[in-house]
């Protein structure tokens, strides 16, 4: 008889989750020479160990520490790109501007990007039927805690001038409840980070407003300044330029500096 399984509100673990994580790890370590020493089987064991057999509403950052340790990686100063509510454009940007890095360009972020996972208390099984939803079920679920953990670490290790890409088309350009607003902003280290520069991406060329004057950006500036980190903001009016450069990275009009 099939055993009783808790029904959660969120979608279940991504199909072929173990195989996907292992394959991504192998691919990443092949492409990034500085991570060739990483043993992908150990990485998977540490990942699995963080949530398997555990009640999926009681996961802690501590559970992910073995994985975080194995995935330790540093970004050169001035090369960290954070983002909020504009993931695709941020990723397209770092695909072209290869010397800048989002969390998803790092091993751990790359492994988990767009995946869902959870286990069950007292069983070694992975739950492919449903996983806890952050709002409807609980915030301390395996996926949310993972991103909180690795985002905190990513922000803590940033240095120099840190950039963040924000979506100017949203009602809250800076959202205190986003991962950027609730985790990363508060974990930038003032002794290492000289400044945070926000890039506010406009919806199109016809929008000529100064979105750096938006009240939520002023709120971000206040939070950052109180932490003794300088704050700068730039309006970016040309998302079409980003996309043009993504499609034609060799186009010489895309090669000049930021």
């Amino acid at each position: 008889l099939p055993r009783w399984r808790q029904q959660w509100s969120g979608s279940g673990t991504t199909s072929r989750f173990p195989e996907t994580v292992l394959a991504r790890c192998v691919k990443y370590t092949e492409v990034h020479p500085e991570m060739r020493h990483v043993d992908c089987q150990s990485v998977w064991d540490a990942f699995k160990g963080a949530f398997i057999s555990k009640y999926p509403c009681n996961i802690t950052e501590e559970d992910y520490q073995p994985l975080v340790k194995l995935g330790t990686q540093t970004v050169p100063c001035n090369k960290t790109l954070l983002w909020s509510r504009i993931k695709d454009l941020a990723h397209q940007f770092t695909q072209v501007q290869r010397d800048m890095f989002t969390l998803e360009d790092m091993l751990l972020g790359y492994l988990a990007d767009d995946l869902t996972w959870c286990g069950e208390f007292n069983t070694f099984e992975i739950n492919y039927q449903s996983c806890p939803d952050w709002r409807k079920d609980c915030s301390n679920n395996p996926v949310s805690v993972f991103w909180k953990t690795v985002s905190r670490r990513f922000a803590e290790t940033a240095c120099g001038v840190v950039h963040v890409m924000l979506n100017g088309s949203r009602s809250k350009i800076f959202d205190k409840n986003s991962t950027f607003g609730s985790v990363e902003v508060h974990n930038l280290q003032p002794e290492k980070v000289q400044a945070l520069e926000a890039w506010v991406i406009h919806g199109g060329r016809e929008d000529s407003r100064d979105l750096c004057q938006d009240p939520t950006i002023k709120e971000l500036e206040s939070i950052i300044s109180k932490r003794n980190i300088r704050f700068f903001c730039k309006n970016i009016y040309r998302p079409d330029k980003f996309l043009q450069c993504v499609k034609n990275p060799e186009d010489s009009s895309c090669l000049s500096g930021i």
Epitope: W199, C212, C233, S253, S256, G257, I258
Partner: antibody, heavy 121, light 105 residues
Framework: QVQLVESGGGLVQPGGSLRLSCAAS????????MNWVRQAPGKGLEWVSG????????YYADSVKGRFTISRDNSKNTLYLQMNSLRAEDTAVYYC??????????????WGQGTLVTVSS | DIELTQPPSVSVAPGQTARISCSGD??????VSWYQQKPGQAPVLVIY???NRPSGIPERFSGSNSGNTATLTISGTQAEDEADYYC????????FGGGTKVEIK
């Protein structure tokens, strides 16, 4: 090397028309947005019009909207500016400029030598 | 649209530092480029994206931008730097400052 050569300028009466051309060489013309910038005698620079790399999007300064039309022929590596209903205040040297830039911003890295348009009766 | 204001002229002795300002409401929120134009010639890009120098432009040219003012600095000015200088920004359309004539005394 990049070269932009404007032509078609001259003396025209108020209300008249003129078509400027800009012949481009030394780069892949179809990869770049192009612009027209003008400079009235003894005055500063004023952006007039721009066109995307494939000509699908066009942009105009308010001062010329409805009177000027920018176009391009990528097969001929040529940029055009059709100027109608010309006024005395349109008198200027017209420069063709290539729009360069990063993902973040845009500027004009290459300019032609300009062609003088004089609107006078 | 953002309005960019430049001083009509700046006078500097050879070898000294010339600073050309370009002011505009919160101009620091926009990227600024600078052009040099000599009489009878087309403009030449000397600074883009606030502080980047195109190849071939001497190191004595530098740029900065914050608050309400962008600045083009020419350190150790030389006779050939005598020209008009224009700042330019972009907010969906291109906007130029009125230009500054740099005179070498």
């Amino acid at each position: 090397q990049v070269q932009l050569v404007e032509s078609g300028g001259g003396l025209v009466q108020p209300g008249g028309s003129l078509r400027l051309s800009c012949a481009a060489s030394g780069f892949t013309f179809s990869s770049y947005a192009m612009n027209w910038v003008r400079q009235a005698p003894g005055k500063g620079l004023e952006w007039v019009s721009g066109i995307s790399s494939w000509g699908s999007s066009t942009y105009y300064a308010d001062s010329v909207k409805g009177r000027f039309t920018i176009s391009r022929d990528n097969s001929k590596n040529t940029l055009y500016l059709q100027m109608n209903s010309l006024r005395a205040e349109d008198t200027a040297v017209y420069y063709c400029a290539r729009e360069d830039g990063s993902y973040m911003t845009d500027y004009f890295a290459y300019w032609g030598q300009g062609t003088l348009v004089t609107v006078s009766s | 649209d953002i309005e960019l204001t430049q001083p009509p002229s700046v006078s500097v002795a050879p070898g000294q530092t010339a600073r050309i300002s370009c002011s505009g409401d919160n101009i620091g929120h926009y990227y600024v480029s600078w052009y040099q134009q000599k009489p009878g010639q087309a403009p030449v890009l000397v600074i883009y994206s606030d502080s980047n120098r195109p190849s071939g432009i001497p190191e004595r040219f530098s740029g900065s931008n914050s608050g309400n003012t962008a600045t083009l600095t020419i350190s150790g000015t030389q006779a050939e730097d005598e020209a008009d200088y224009y700042c330019q920004s972009y907010n969906g359309t291109y906007v130029f400052g009125g230009g500054t004539k740099v005179e070498i005394k």
